[in-house]
């Protein structure tokens, strides 16, 4: 008799793939333009990335540092109207993209929570949650919560409102903190909160350190669902050396939890790489005409158009990973086990019941390395085979689908491998 299938865990929509942050509508859409109506025209692109949710905004009226002139129920006319927003919601729904609204109150000011009149601010947030839930949004994001006093109690209250409306709604909180204790204390009072932080960016970017960061985080947060990013709002390129971008994309998509990206991460967009761009919101490079101020400043391989046509590009890798992440059970909700491998490497397995299993091997080092996989510290349920098929490599030159002998596995500098192998009873 075949062994009994393991019962599937309850899966919320944000468990099924990546979230994509558009913090600056105008920068995302390109120079001089950018509103909700225009964003609707970019939904096909987001669909092609297979992201499950769009974290949008803030979009509300906010007069810098003025609580009274901040209206979380009103869309700033520069971004469009409530009708434009409703249309965007409808179109996104048709494409199975959920919309999460950023309600960080004082986004134009220096202190995102005003650092004053917290009773008024909290009441405004509470009213806004109720209003926008009725309007049909799928969740909310609030950032910089380490600067909101009594953040835990407010988050608990806001989560109650969000989940009280529907368990299918999500609350995301962002913090600049990279301190695990602080992060855990924020998570403790909120069972379903998704927290983005700078935790992973406080790294020496070695295999050993990254492994230790990931395992400490997972141990500290127990069996709760995590999110993975390098910051609450910034681009990957702001935190990572360029040679590790592909490696981190592979890692973020294959760790147990929800990967969270900012617009441009998929093409390696750099903050302020081009003259006159604000550091926090560089213009998205759709094609070579995206930066008309300086002819020739943008080359094709920096753009969405150029990278879409190149199967070896970062964008193509992102799409491949996003596709795998959203359809493979082991990557969707599989168990996670790290195991010993060569110095400079971080290796782990994702497996779920009798489904195909995935092996991830990441070489953070500047030199080619023998993988030296040692499965002795793996549980019996997650043993390694002698061979596994290559799903993808972060570097060119390997043939996808080819079987690789794990004992003889060698990795190029900064190479990451995603391998698959079948369950064997």
């Amino acid at each position: 008799r075949a062994p009994r299938c393991r019962e599937l865990p309850a899966q919320k929509w944000w468990h099924t793939g990546a979230l994509y942050r558009i913090g600056d509508l105008q920068a995302f859409q390109g120079h001089g333009s950018g509103n909700l109506a225009g964003l609707k025209g970019r939904l096909d692109y987001l669909s092609s990335l297979k992201v499950k949710g769009l974290v949008l905004g803030p979009l509300h009226k906010n007069q810098k540092d003025d609580v009274a002139q901040t209206d979380l129920l009103q869309i700033d006319p520069n971004f469009g109207s409530k009708e434009d927003f409703d249309n965007l919601l409808q179109s996104a729904k048709k494409k199975s993209i959920r919309v999460i609204l950023d309600l960080t109150p004082n986004y134009r000011g220096e202190n995102l929570w005003f650092s004053t009149q917290v009773d008024s601010v909290a009441t405004k947030v509470k009213d806004a949650l109720e209003f926008w839930l009725q309007a049909g949004v799928d969740g909310f994001q609030v950032r910089d919560i380490e600067n909101l006093k009594d953040a835990s109690s407010f988050l608990a209250e806001w989560e109650n409102i969000t989940k009280g409306f529907s368990e299918d709604r999500l609350l995301i909180a962002g913090t600049n903190s990279s301190d695990l204790q602080q992060i855990v204390s924020l998570l403790e009072s909120n069972k379903d909160l998704l927290l983005t932080s700078s935790y992973l960016s406080d790294s020496s970017f070695t295999g050993e350190h990254t492994k230790s960061l990931v395992t400490q985080y997972l141990n500290a947060t127990g069996n709760r669902w995590c999110s993975w990013s390098l910051s609450q709002a910034g681009l990957l390129t702001s935190f990572l050396p360029a040679q590790l971008l592909r490696l981190y994309q592979l890692m973020l998509f294959t760790l147990p939890g929800t990967p969270v990206f900012s617009y441009g991460d998929e093409i390696g967009l750099k903050a302020a790489a081009l003259p006159g761009q604000p550091v926090e919101a560089p213009v998205m490079l759709w094609d070579e005409s995206s930066f008309p101020d300086i002819p020739g400043a943008v080359s094709a391989n920096m753009t969405v158009k150029g990278q879409s046509e190149d199967p070896g590009s970062l964008l193509s890798l992102f799409r491949q990973l996003s596709d795998q992440r959203s359809k493979e059970r082991s990557l969707l909700h599989g168990d996670f086990h790290t195991f010993s491998s060569g110095p400079g490497l971080f290796s782990y397995i994702r497996h779920w019941d009798q489904n195909e299993r995935f092996l991830v091997v990441l070489n953070f080092g500047d030199v080619g390395l023998s993988a030296g996989l040692q499965a002795s510290d793996l549980p019996a349920s997650a043993s390694l085979p002698t061979k596994a098929d290559l799903v993808l490599s972060t570097q060119p030159g390997r043939e996808e689908g080819s079987p690789l002998e794990l004992e003889r596995l060698k990795l190029e500098p900064h190479e990451g491998l995603l391998l698959r192998f079948p369950y064997v009873a």
């Epitope: 005003f114 650092s115 004053t116 009773d119 008024s120 380490e146 600067n147 006093k149 109690s153």
Partner: antibody
């Protein structure tokens, strides 16, 4: 116009009790955190207690020096905040102000509490 | 508890001169700092909250600055009506605490 008016102060013996009231008008009382702050020549301005909103389960916080002796409460239907003071001591003497918000954007004129034998 | 220290208890400044009053917190208070002005016989009046945000109706000669543990109240050109005692208060964590006050008089 925002108005806060304290009452209930006076002379009381050590060990005695007293209740202060503060009636508010000119703003949405039920949406505002309320505080009691006292002032004496010896200690200067000293925050005493805070009460939050119904949605915060009327959470209260107290200065260490009054914990277990003073109780802050509110009646949103009457736009009134109270401070019940028990087991009063000489060092509790001072002017007691109620203030609205966080920090106190509006203050009453204060009521004098004198604890003396 | 977070202690708030105002280094000067008294300041004597000539009319029209710039005044700087400092306040130091014993721990980080993330800009959750207020400045109050109190004149004899009156309740304190909020001038600045969030370390830098000027309350409505407060003259623009008043300004606040600082972050972390160190904060400053400045008056660009001292006027007669500015004679008062100035207090800082942290309201980042309970118990909220006030500084000891700085009494400002005209030289």
């Amino acid at each position: 116009e925002v108005k806060l008016e304290e009452s209930g102060g006076g002379l009381v013996q050590p060990g005695g009790s007293m209740i202060l009231s503060c009636v508010a008008s000119g703003f949405t009382f039920s949406n505002s955190w309320m505080n009691w702050v006292r002032q004496s020549p010896e200690k200067g301005l000293e925050w005493v207690a805070e009460i939050r909103l119904r949605s915060n389960n009327y959470a209260t916080h107290y200065a260490e020096s009054v914990k277990g002796r003073f109780t802050i409460s509110r009646d949103d239907s009457k736009s009134t905040v109270y401070l019940q003071m028990n087991n009063l001591r000489a060092e509790d003497t001072g002017i007691y102000y109620c203030s609205r918000g966080d920090p106190g954007a509006y203050w009453g004129q204060g009521t004098l509490v004198t604890v003396s034998a | 508890d977070i202690q708030m220290t105002q280094s000067s208890s008294y300041l004597s400044v000539s009319l029209g001169n710039r005044v700087t009053i400092t306040c130091k917190a014993s721990d980080h208070i993330k800009n959750w700092l207020a400045w109050f002005q109190q004149k004899p016989g009156n309740a304190p009046r909020l001038l600045i909250s969030g370390a830098t945000i000027l309350e409505t109706g407060v003259p623009s000669r008043f300004s606040g600055s600082g972050s972390g543990k160190d904060y400053t109240l400045s008056i660009t050109s001292l006027q007669t009506e500015d004679v008062a005692t100035y207090y800082c208060q942290q309201y980042w964590s309970t118990p909220y605490t006030f500084g000891g006050g700085t009494k400002l008089e005209i030289k």
